[in-house]
Interface confidence: low
């Protein structure tokens, strides 16, 4: 009978082991070991035993001890099991973005490692074990499917191998892959809400607001706002799970007509879009024309209002007859018309909405100069020593200059409060002069003396 000790050994790859071979008889004819491994006999041995050192053990092996005793030949094997940790533990790349509510498949490849019977592969979320499987195949590939929620955003997933040799060498060897961080997102099925003017005038500024609720993570959402080919530059305000993008838009004459306003909210690898039609229109203010803006009294003046061909106008509140883009009327200029405003209001229908524009012109009427009895009385009688204010108002456009002189030298203090004296008495020549000419009027001042009792 041949004996071997130890009958079983578990050792690291490349390691060494001492094995004792012994025979049951005291003086065996032969005693040795058969193995492809590098071996060295450790001397001195005994009469019926030998010790061998086996080195650089790279793979499982069964060295055989043999002995030849007088009662016959026999052999015994020792079982060498080599262990080594995996060389590659790799978690397959995660999708750049994972929709919330959709299952995620985690996949791990493990290359190398032995003994495979003691090697398990775990898929982890942080330190929480999601799945534990045996390593089968080369490379071993394990998969598991997990549901994804909002709380998985930013979570680290990894793959870990465990080589459990605790029954043999009281050791547990672990290898962990580089962690992969998951980015989850939740984009609602509802399109964004878009608030914008339905009509927009060329060269004016409008405001567009696009908003969407139920986004996660809202900070990663991107908003694209465009009117036709014009990309808008919105200011984005973020709420808890919502965003609002506000942009100013200015349109040019080139964009006149119907344009598409587009708001797109992009999150993860998905987009929600809303489109709206905006009508861009050009509507200049109407023209108010006077045959002449400055005329002499008595002159006939034509007032004309003209607007956009599709507009309807009102001139001084009176609609054009028939309704249309032109209106006019004729007037004979009077002094009362000086400074009079002629207002034209134009209304245009754009995409079912009425838009308005106004224009005003003022008429200047040249008249005078005038000196009337009403405004410059020809006779004043005042008690001596009383306080009086001589009044004489000249009228005209342009406004005339007024002088009242007695004997060509003594002025009447028009508009000033004076004490009536004898010197004030007399006839004054009042002269009103403008670029249009001059008029004169005589004004007599009588002074009443007090009665002496």
């Amino acid at each position: 009978q041949t004996s071997v000790f130890p009958p079983e050994v578990i050792l690291p790859r490349g390691g060494s082991v001492k094995v004792n071979c012994s025979a049951s008889c005291d003086q065996p004819i032969s005693l040795g070991m058969e193995t492809p491994l590098p071996k060295k006999e450790i001397l001195p041995g005994g009469n019926n035993w030998k010790m061998y050192e086996l080195s650089n053990v790279q793979e499982d092996s069964q060295p055989m001890c043999y002995s030849n005793c007088p009662d016959g030949q026999s052999s015994a094997k020792t079982l060498l099991t080599v262990y080594w940790t995996p060389e590659r533990v790799e978690l397959a790349p995660l999708p750049p973005w994972q929709p919330v509510g959709k299952n995620l498949t985690l996949r791990c490849q493990v290359e190398g490692g032995a003994p495979r019977a003691n090697l398990t592969v775990m898929l982890l979320r942080g330190e929480k074990e999601l799945s534990r499987q045996s390593a089968v195949g080369e490379p071993a590939e394990v998969t598991t499917t997990v549901p994804v929620g909002r709380d998985d955003h930013g979570a680290n997933f990894s793959c870990r191998t465990e080589l459990d040799l605790r029954p043999y060498v009281l050791k547990l060897f672990e290898n962990t892959s580089a962690p992969h961080q998951l980015q989850t997102f939740d984009l609602p099925a509802t399109p964004p809400q878009l608030v914008s003017p339905q009509v927009l005038e060329v060269d004016t500024q409008g405001t567009v607001v696009c908003s969407l609720d139920g986004l996660f993570p809202v900070s990663e959402a991107q908003v694209s706002l465009a009117l036709g080919d014009q990309k808008l530059n919105p200011t984005i305000t973020y709420g808890n799970n919502s965003l609002s993008a506000k942009a100013s838009v200015k349109v040019t004459a080139e964009e006149e007509g119907t344009q598409q306003l587009l708001c797109g909210v992009m999150l993860g690898n998905q987009t929600q879009e809303t489109r709206q039609t905006v009508t861009i229109y050009s509507f200049p203010a109407p023209n108010v024309n006077l045959t002449k803006p400055e005329v002499s009294e008595g002159t006939e003046v034509i007032v004309e209002c003209e607007a956009h061909p599709r507009a309807k106008v009102m001139l001084n509140g009176v609609p054009a007859q028939p309704p249309g883009p032109r209106a006019q009327f004729l007037l004979k200029a009077t002094p009362e018309d000086n400074g009079r405003s002629f207002s034209c209001s134009a209304t245009l229908e754009v995409a079912g909405q009425l838009v308005h524009k106004n224009q005003t012109r003022e008429l200047r009427v040249l008249y005078g100069p005038r000196l009337d009895e009403k405004d410059c009385p020809g006779n004043w009688t005042w008690p001596e020593n009383s306080q009086q204010t001589p009044m004489c108002q000249a009228w005209g456009n342009p406004l005339p200059q007024l002088k009242c002189l007695k004997d060509g030298t003594f002025p009447l203090p028009i508009g000033q409060s004076v004490t009536v004296t004898r010197d004030l008495e007399g006839t004054y020549l009042c002269q009103a002069r403008s670029t249009r000419g001059e008029v004169t009027r005589e004004v007599t001042v009588n002074v009443l003396s007090p009665r002496y009792e």
Partner: antibody
Framework: QSLEESGGRLVTPGGSLTLTCTVS????????MSWVRQAPGKGLEYIGW?????SAYYANWAKGRFTISKTSTTVDLKITSPTTEDTATYFC???????????????WGPGTLVTVSS | AFELTQTPSSVEAAVGGTVTIKCQAS??????LSWYQQKPGQPPKLLIY???TLASGVSSRFKGSGSGTEFTLTISDLESADAATYYC?????????????FGGGTEVVVK
């Protein structure tokens, strides 16, 4: 962090040649290291790699023709019995740490030219 | 034997244009695929790994997509500095199956 290959030279067919990749700025006990070659005017050809723990792996075509080994700061590629077809620039490159992404080569040396000619 | 086939072998495009390079694996490698850029006289440079993830410091003009057996590298707003040869590489499985294998390369010429 850098890699530099050396040892490239003119060698006669059947001779033996060892290329060395010297690393600095990181530890070879944490990274897998690969050898890749490129014949003049041709594409890249993956030869093999050595793991953080020192195990070497070879592409099927390279088995028996190349030996990869390492010390604490160098990785060697031994070309046994080269032929004219082994004329190429040989690059060493670093993979991921601790076995992860072994073949994703994010740090390369400038390469060393080996010419096999009689 | 496992193979990565790149098409086309050469492509020419103008500055500002777009180039698309395809890489086909002879068997599924999920998304274990990298892309490299190599300029004459220089070592390759990692552009993309995990089929679509940009390596650090790489311009967002480079975009990788695909999984399984069909992969694409798209270079948009082409610049003269993009003139180079581009290689795809598998990192699925062991080295004796598909690990480490490179595609044949695509030369990009910028006019």
């Amino acid at each position: 962090q850098s890699l530099e290959e050396s040892g490239g030279r003119l060698v006669t067919p059947g001779g033996s040649l060892t290329l060395t990749c010297t690393v600095s700025g990181f530890s070879l006990s944490s990274y897998g290291m690969s050898w890749v070659r490129q014949a003049p005017g041709k594409g890249l050809e993956y030869i093999g790699w050595i793991s953080f723990s020192g195990s070497a792996y070879y592409a099927n075509w390279a088995k028996g023709r190349f030996t990869i080994s390492k010390t604490s700061t160098t990785v060697d590629l031994k070309i046994t019995s080269p032929t004219t077809e082994d004329t190429a620039t040989y690059f060493c490159a670093r993979g991921g740490d601790y076995g992860g992404s072994t073949y994703i080569l994010n740090l390369w040396g400038p390469g060393t030219l080996v010419t096999v000619s009689s | 034997a496992f193979e990565l086939t790149q098409t086309p072998s050469s492509v020419e495009a103008a500055v500002g244009g777009t180039v698309t390079i395809k890489c086909q694996a002879s068997e599924s490698i999920n998304s274990y695929l990298s892309w490299y850029q190599q300029k004459p006289g220089q070592p390759p440079k990692l552009l993309i790994y995990a089929a679509s993830t940009l390596a650090s410091g790489v311009s967002s003009r480079f975009k990788g997509s695909g999984s399984g057996t069909e992969f694409t590298l798209t270079i948009s707003d082409l610049e003269s500095a993009d003139a180079a040869t581009y290689y795809c590489q598998s990192y699925s499985g062991t080295i004796s199956t598909s690990g480490g294998a490179f595609g044949g390369g695509t030369e990009v010429v910028v006019k």
